[in-house]
């Protein structure tokens, strides 16, 4: 039975040209995280594998940085980066947990981050 829950940074906004941290946290389960995939719609951005470390998709290498932790940092944001991002936690023995973050990239300098929670 899958007992875990994923907390995310929720709906967030950022300025064009800036950077943003996408972060998820899996709680309420003792399952071992074997891999976390970060995806934008149907595109794979990055993988963090518990055994094998990070892999950044070649097309995103210039604008994506691993971390902090299992999170992902998006840099040099453009308006085209607006959209849904998913953290997909592969765990043993539970299976797969998915979290959703919506990022809005704004032209103006009035972008405000959504409410954040502390991720250990």
């Amino acid at each position: 039975m899958m007992t875990g829950t994923i907390e995310t940074t929720g709906n967030i906004s950022a300025e064009k040209g800036g950077s943003i941290i996408l972060q998820c946290h899996l709680s309420s389960t003792t399952a071992q995280v074997t891999q976390v995939n970060w995806e934008q719609q149907d595109q794979l951005l990055a993988i963090c594998n518990a055994d094998l470390g990070w892999h950044i998709s070649p097309s995103f290498k210039d604008r994506v940085a691993p971390g902090p932790g299992l999170g992902l940092t998006l840099q040099s944001l453009t308006v085209n980066d607006t959209g849904e991002y998913f953290c997909i936690y592969h765990t043993y023995p539970d299976g797969t947990y998915t979290g959703r973050i919506f990022l809005e990239v704004l032209e103006s300098s009035v972008a405000e981050h959504g409410a954040r929670f502390q991720i250990p």
Epitope: Q32, T34, N49, A50, D51, L52, G53, W54, H55, K61, A65, P66, G67, Y92, P93
Partner: antibody, heavy 118, light 107 residues
Framework: QLQLVQSGAEVKKPGASVKVSCKAS????????MNWVRQAPGQSLEWIGV????????SYNQKFKGRVTMTRDQSTSTAYMELNSLRSEDTAVYYC???????????WGQGTLVTVSS | DIQMTQSPSSLSASVGDRVTITCRPS??????LAWYQQKPGKAPKLLIY???ALAEGVPSRFSGSGSGTDFTLTISSLQPEDFATYYC?????????FGQGTKVEIK
């Protein structure tokens, strides 16, 4: 305290196989990955592969794929690395090493010298 | 695979000297770099991880810096027990690779 103890030195002929063991103590064996790293005489270190002792996932350095087999015995907290079709260039000290945190190796076995000679 | 280039391959220094070793990966590894010390006939010992974090029990005269493709290990005041070979290793994404080593010898 936390320790990795490896099996003794081996001398093998070309074409033979060798199996090196690594017994863990002082921690929960299934909690941390076990890596194998080798060092030829006077050379640098070379990562061979990793086994996750909990669910048994194994990943090999492509250079060794097909020649190396990693296994573990949870009941004895022991990891094994078998290398077959040995050649003279496989002469090296073979180390087991934990990645206790993330992907660097902070606990090492004492090393096992494998000599391949006709 | 990521290639790790260390320099110099060897150096001679005296007790009390400040020693600097550099490591240059062939591609960006962010801060995923570790440094090890190895003495003859012994297993490597972890000194630094995440480019600058000191491993447990390692003296504060050892320090690491850098990110991306340029990293440095510094020994601020060389002690007799520091004469050894030093290796860098990236821990970004497998396969993990090591530099060719820097041997620190007594002048």
């Amino acid at each position: 305290q936390l320790q990795l103890v490896q099996s003794g030195a081996e001398v093998k002929k070309p074409g033979a196989s060798v199996k090196v063991s690594c017994k863990a103590s002082g921690y929960s064996f299934t909690d941390y990955n076990m890596n194998w790293v080798r060092q030829a005489p006077g050379q640098s270190l070379e990562w061979i592969g990793v086994i996750n002792p909990n669910h048994g996932t194994i990943s090999y350095n492509q250079k060794f794929k097909g020649r190396v087999t990693m296994t573990r015995d949870q009941s004895t907290s022991t990891a094994y690395m078998e290398l077959n079709s040995l050649r003279s260039e496989d002469t090296a000290v073979y180390y087991c090493a934990n990645n206790w945190d993330v992907w660097y190796f902070d606990v090492w076995g004492q090393g096992t010298l494998v000599t391949v000679s006709s | 695979d990521i290639q790790m280039t260390q320099s110099p391959s060897s150096l001679s220094a005296s007790v009390g000297d400040r020693v600097t070793i550099t490591c240059r990966p062939s591609e960006n590894i962010y801060s995923y770099l570790a440094w090890y010390q190895q003495k003859p006939g012994k297993a490597p010992k972890l000194l630094i991880y995440n480019a600058k974090a000191l491993a447990e029990g390692v003296p504060s005269r050892f320090s690491g810096s850098g990110s991306g493709t340029d990293f440095t290990l510094t020994i601020s005041s060389l002690q007799p027990e520091d004469f050894a070979t030093y290796y860098c290793q990236h821990h970004f994404g497998a396969p993990w690779t090591f530099g060719q080593g820097t041997k620190v010898e007594i002048k």
